[in-house]
Interface confidence: low
């Protein structure tokens, strides 16, 4: 067995993907490991090969079906195991009884686009991707705007406490390049976390009209 501290964290994207990260201090880099998913009330089971993402952590995605298929429900429990090969055997290195709708992380929002841009404001819309119909409107969003000379970490967060797939950014500077990102989170789930940030959308405000007070 491999000694050391182990951490095994997984999230369900609400449709057909469970993403897992396993961290193990002192684990052997050349050991072949996989995640095995065994639902309590489904006829299928699934595995994925853990691939290294850093010195002591590995990640993989359990693809449960077509991207928009609803493979699990709020009553499912999936036993997730990290199995590592030791000779001819697979040894269980970590195990958890995973409640998918208590451990949600949605896909990043997609299809960001500028609906309308002016000198001081910009209206932006987006779409959510592979989100379960179970949520209905029970989603929230965070958005941030990168302005010149600043970093993403410095950007103030704008919170939308409802399923609103657009925003009107105000008090922008004319003729200035900005970038915009948004992320989404269901209200459901004790261990639910924010989605990754969307791909940045670059846009430029219109220049102020000559001879006019801006």
């Amino acid at each position: 067995a491999v000694n050391g501290t182990s951490q095994f964290t997984c999230f369900y994207n609400s449709r057909a993907n469970i993403s897992c990260v396993w961290s193990q201090d002192g684990a052997l880099q050349d050991t072949s490991c996989q995640v095995h998913a065994w639902p309590d009330r489904r006829r299928w089971n699934q595995t994925c090969e853990l691939l290294p993402v850093s010195q002591a952590s590995w990640a993989c995605n359990l693809i449960l079906g077509a991207p928009d298929s609803q493979k699990l429900t709020t009553v499912d429990i999936v036993t997730l195991r990290v199995l590592c090969r030791e000779g001819v055997r697979w040894r269980v290195m970590a195990i958890q009884d995973f409640k998918p709708f208590e451990n949600l992380r949605l896909m990043a929002p997609i299809s960001l686009q500028v609906v309308h841009v002016e000198t001081h404001r910009c209206n932006i819309s987006w779409e959510i991707s592979q989100a379960s119909h179970y949520f209905e409107r029970h989603l929230e969003f965070e958005a941030r705007t990168l302005s010149p000379g600043h970093t993403w970490e410095e950007a103030p967060l704008l919170t939308l406490k409802q399923k609103q797939e657009w925003i009107c950014l105000e008090t922008l500077t004319p003729d200035t390049q900005y970038e915009f990102q948004v992320r989404v989170k269901p209200l459901q789930g004790e261990f639910t976390t924010w989605s990754p940030w969307s791909q940045p959308l670059a846009f430029r405000t219109k220049p102020a009209a000559l001879g006019k007070d801006t």
Partner: nanobody, 123 residues
């Protein structure tokens, strides 16, 4: 160390039912995954079904799905295999197996085995 003893085998007609039991002695029965395998003459031992430590997770080989049901009673240190609608091709020696830390369908992954019980299904 775990000892496993199967019982309940016998000779039945096609379409009838049998219930196999596997009694375990030793500690920590509830920490073992339990499986049933079967062997027909001249063939490899074949995975039939598995039940997880708590009994919440079960899986079956396709050929027995809908006919066989595995269960366990951790208070009695026993695992059961209810076999309904038996067919002649179910004729085999049935073995129960216990795995600590191992969870799979391959026989080499199981640490403890019973001696087997014969099931014969006549047409």
């Amino acid at each position: 160390e775990v000892q496993l003893v199967e019982s309940g085998g016998g000779l039945v007609q096609a379409g009838e039912s049998l219930r196999l039991s596997c009694a375990a002695s030793g500690q920590y029965f509830s920490t073992y995954s339990m499986a049933w395998f079967r062997r027909t003459p001249g063939k490899e031992r074949e995975f039939v079904t598995i039940i997880s430590e708590s009994g919440g997770i079960k899986e079956y080989v396709d050929s027995v799905k809908g006919r066989f049901t595995v269960s366990r009673d951790n208070a009695k240190n026993t695992v059961y295999l209810q076999m309904n609608s038996l067919k002649p091709e179910d004729t085999a020696v049935y073995y129960c197996a216990a795995a600590r830390d191992w969870f799979a369908r391959n026989e080499y992954q199981y640490d403890y085995w019973g001696q087997g019980t014969q099931v014969t299904v006549s047409s």
